[in-house]
C-alpha cells in the first residue's frame, strides 16, 4: 500500500514499503520477491489497445 501523503508512483514503478520509495517494476525480473512487485503485477507496464471497439 502506498504510504499516506506521498505522490503516486510513475508508470512502470510501484511503492516499496520496505525501501520507503517508488521502485522500478523492471527490477522484478531480477528480484521477483520484492514487496513492490505485487503492485507491478496488478497493472500492465505499458498501455494496450482493446481488440474490440
Amino acid at each position: 500500500e502506498q504510504a499516506p501523503g506521498t505522490a503516486p508512483c510513475s508508470r512502470g514503478s510501484s511503492w516499496s514499503a520496505d525501501l520507503d520509495k517508488c521502485m522500478d517494476c523492471a527490477s522484478c525480473r531480477a528480484r521477483p520477491h520484492s514487496d513492490f512487485c505485487l503492485g507491478c503485477a496488478a497493472a500492465p507496464p505499458a498501455p494496450f489497445r482493446l481488440l474490440w471497439p
Epitope: D24, S27, R29, R31, H33
Partner: antibody, heavy 120, light 111 residues
Framework: EVKLEESGGGLVQPGGSMKLSCVVS????????MSWVRQSPEKGLEWVAE???????????HYAESVKGKFTVSRDDSKSRLYLQMSSLRPEDTGIYYC??????????WGQGTSVTVSS | DIVLTQSPASLVVSLGQRATISCRAS??????????MHWYQQKPGQPPKLLIK???KLDSGVPARFSGSGSGTDFTLNIHPVEEEDTATYYC?????????FGGGTKMEIK
C-alpha cells in the same frame, strides 16, 4: 546522502595479495546488491564481482571469468561494509576499483574508487 | 558474454546542438515490457554516474535534455541541447545476464 568509500588500494608486486574495503552510509545496505567494477585505459570499465543480499539465495556471489578463483567478494551487513580479497595479482589487474550499490540492474551508487597497481 | 559496441568512439558537438550516441548489443537485452540497458556519464577524475536506466527512464536529478531509446539490440542516447557541462565519456551497460558488461565508451567534446 548516499556515500560509498573505498580503501585498501596501493602498489603490490605480481603474485601478491590485497584486500579492498568499502564502507557505505545513507543506504539500507542489507537490501542492496553490491559489485566491484574496475577501470583501466586498456580494458575500460570491467565488472569484476557481485554479491547479492542474504534474503536472495544466501548472498549469492558472481565473478568475471578473469578473476574466478583469484578474487573473493564478501559483505558485513552489521558494519555496512563490502570487501574484495584479491590474490595471485597480475599486472592486468591494475586499475581503479569502484564499489557500487544497486537494488538490481542499473548501478545507482558509485564510490570514488581506489587505485590498485600491480608492478615489480 | 554480451558484447556492447558503442559508436562513435568520439564526437565533437556544437553548443546547443544534438548529440547522438549508439550502443549495439550482440544479442537482445529486452523482454516484451522492458529493456535492460543503462547509460552512464563519466567526467575526468570522477566515477561514472547513472543517467538513464531501462533504456529510457531518466535517473532522479538528470536533466530532461538527456533521453534514451531503443529495444532489442539497438539503443540510443540523445542529448539536446548540448551544454558545456556535458563534456564527458558516456557508457552503456546491460543487465540481461551475468557477466554484466559495458560498452567501450564515447568521448564527447563541446565546441
Amino acid at each position: 546522502e548516499v556515500k560509498l568509500e573505498e580503501s585498501g588500494g596501493g602498489l603490490v608486486q605480481p603474485g601478491g595479495s590485497m584486500k579492498l574495503s568499502c564502507v557505505v552510509s545513507g543506504l539500507t545496505f542489507s537490501r542492496y546488491w553490491m559489485s566491484w567494477v574496475r577501470q583501466s585505459p586498456e580494458k575500460g570499465l570491467e565488472w569484476v564481482a557481485e554479491i547479492r543480499v542474504k534474503s536472495d539465495n544466501y548472498a549469492t556471489t558472481h565473478y568475471a571469468e578473469s578473476v574466478k578463483g583469484k578474487f573473493t567478494v564478501s559483505r558485513d551487513d552489521s558494519k555496512s561494509r563490502l570487501y574484495l580479497q584479491m590474490s595471485s595479482l597480475r599486472p592486468e589487474d591494475t586499475g581503479i576499483y569502484y564499489c557500487i550499490g544497486y537494488y538490481a540492474d542499473a548501478m545507482d551508487y558509485w564510490g570514488q574508487g581506489t587505485s590498485v597497481t600491480v608492478s615489480s | 558474454d554480451i558484447v556492447l559496441t558503442q559508436s562513435p568512439a568520439s564526437l565533437v558537438v556544437s553548443l546547443g546542438q544534438r548529440a547522438t550516441i549508439s550502443c549495439r548489443a550482440s544479442q537482445s537485452v529486452s523482454t516484451s515490457s522492458y529493456s535492460y540497458m543503462h547509460w552512464y556519464q563519466q567526467k575526468p577524475g570522477q566515477p561514472p554516474k547513472l543517467l538513464i536506466k531501462y533504456a529510457s527512464k531518466l535517473d532522479s536529478g538528470v536533466p530532461a535534455r538527456f533521453s534514451g531509446s531503443g529495444s532489442g539490440t539497438d539503443f540510443t542516447l540523445n542529448i539536446h541541447p548540448v551544454e558545456e557541462e556535458d563534456t564527458a565519456t558516456y557508457y552503456c551497460q546491460h543487465s540481461w545476464e551475468i557477466p554484466w558488461t559495458f560498452g567501450g565508451g564515447t568521448k564527447m567534446e563541446i565546441k
